[in-house]
């Protein structure tokens, strides 16, 4: 038995537990997600049993060998697989647990605006960066763009602080995930805030 | 220096196939998205397609996609172009390419490798 | 897919001269619109990103400006070293696409 393998896919994608065999003579190979059996495998008579037929579809063992390739991949399908070879000639079955992880691709984030305000001809605000369907390990970077500036901000929330009269910056919010990246609309400084200009305190989103 | 070498070029038959590596130097291979893009003689820049860190998402121009396979090997910090059923539309220098900061644009380029298609 | 057209392939200008290379997407792209540069027998090299802003390195001379689907590289003061093509090449939606690039000619 090896060590806990991690392995990411994305919706509608396909992935592959990888699985080398040392084993001579196997009887059957067993494969189990969050102990549910998936797939049974009798080489002998050249057998697959696949439990659910939803997956008969889905499942496939490339060039022949007993690696388990899952298609179609949904958000459902992540959690813990388990391997077993089982073999007259073992005492205890060969066994390999994997871990899959299957994220969403991402679509643009939406970006809302806090309470504004204008102080001194300051606009001071803040810009939250959001997922609208509250996608899972989605990291956020901020990019302000500027004639002045080109500096990159961590976070979902950016605090601005534009004074009228300085060159315009456009902010562009960044949204990745271990499968794809996306970006919002870039939301420019003084379109941003012009609502703030005459009213000391607005609020808009 | 960070750095991306290209091999793997040559003359090929039409129908063919052909395997190009791209070789990742001075930087972390394995935290990046890589692309491959082609020029084919006189021509503007073709971008064929991209493939995450963990090899989990390819992207590819449509057109391009039943013939080309992108795959990567971050132990060997290689990215690979798996061409079949070449053409002699396919004639071009292959470039391979990392995106600035993992965005979108390209800020390093190889020097390319060339293949030729013909019979 | 998005056609990111450059209409002029050839433009020529003198030393010290200014000019200003077009390109124009088939449909709104923002300013997910970068430059490159690529001198003969070199590999491209990135200018300009998000439109407008420069590359680590880039002289100033060069200047993005656009948004939608107009999109213009400025090269102020010209110098020889600046023969060479320069390609647009739009992020927006896949897959990314180029536009066929317009050769700048020193006189």
């Known amino acids: 038995s090896g060590p806990v393998k991690e392995l990411v896919g994305s919706v509608g994608g396909a992935v592959t537990f990888p699985l080398k065999s040392k084993v001579k003579q196997v009887d059957s190979i067993v494969w189990t997600f969050n102990t549910t059996p998936l797939v049974t495998i009798q080489p002998e008579g050249g057998t697959i049993i696949v439990t659910q037929n939803r997956n008969r579809e889905r499942v496939d063992f490339p060039d022949g060998g007993y690696s388990l390739k899952l298609s179609k991949l949904k958000k459902n399908d992540s959690g813990i697989y388990y391997v077993g070879i089982y073999s007259s000639s073992l005492q205890q079955p060969s066994t390999q647990e994997y871990v899959l992880h299957v994220y969403e691709h991402l679509s643009k984030p939406k970006v809302t605006m806090g309470l504004q305000s204008n102080k001194n001809g300051t606009c001071v605000t803040n810009l939250t960066c959001c997922m609208e369907h509250g996608e899972e390990d989605v990291i956020y970077t901020w990019k302000a763009l500027g004639q002045a500036a080109n500096e990159s901000h961590n976070g979902s929330i950016l605090p601005i602080s534009w004074r009228w009269g300085e060159s315009d910056m456009t902010f562009i919010c960044v949204a990745r995930n271990p499968v794809s990246r996306n970006f919002s609309s870039p939301i420019l400084a003084r379109k941003l805030c012009e609502g703030a200009a005459d009213d000391p305190d607005s609020s808009m989103v | 220096e960070v750095k991306l070498l290209e091999s793997g070029g040559g003359l090929v038959q039409p129908g063919g196939s052909l395997k190009l590596s791209c070789a990742a130097s001075?930087?972390?291979?394995?935290?990046?998205?890589m692309s491959w893009v082609r020029q084919a003689p006189g021509k503007g820049l073709e971008w064929i397609g991209e493939?995450?860190?963990?090899?989990?998402?390819?992207n590819y121009t449509p057109s391009l996609k039943d013939k080309f396979i992108i795959s990567r090997d971050n132990a060997k910090n290689t990215l690979y172009l798996q061409m079949s059923k070449v053409r002699s539309e396919d004639t071009a220098l292959y470039y391979c390419a990392r995106p600035d900061g993992n965005y979108w644009y390209f800020d390093v380029w190889g020097a390319g490798t060339t293949v030729t298609v013909s019979s | 897919d998005i056609v990111m057209t450059q209409s002029h392939k050839f433009m020529s200008t003198s030393v010290g001269d200014r000019v200003s290379i077009t390109c124009k997407a088939s449909?709104?792209?923002?300013?997910?619109v970068a430059w490159y540069q690529q001198k003969p027998g070199q590999s491209p090299k990135l200018l300009i990103y998000w439109a407008s802003t420069r590359h680590t390195g880039v002289p100033d001379r060069f200047t993005g400006s656009g948004s939608g689907t107009d999109f213009t590289l400025t090269i102020s003061n010209v110098q020889s070293e600046d023969l060479a093509d320069y390609f647009c090449q739009q992020y927006s939606s896949y897959p990314y696409t180029f536009g066929g690039g317009t050769k700048l000619e020193i006189k």
């Open positions: 493939i995450n860190p963990d090899s989990s998402t390819i």
């Open positions: 001075g930087f972390d291979f394995s935290r990046y998205w």
């Open positions: 449909q709104d792209v923002g300013i997910a």
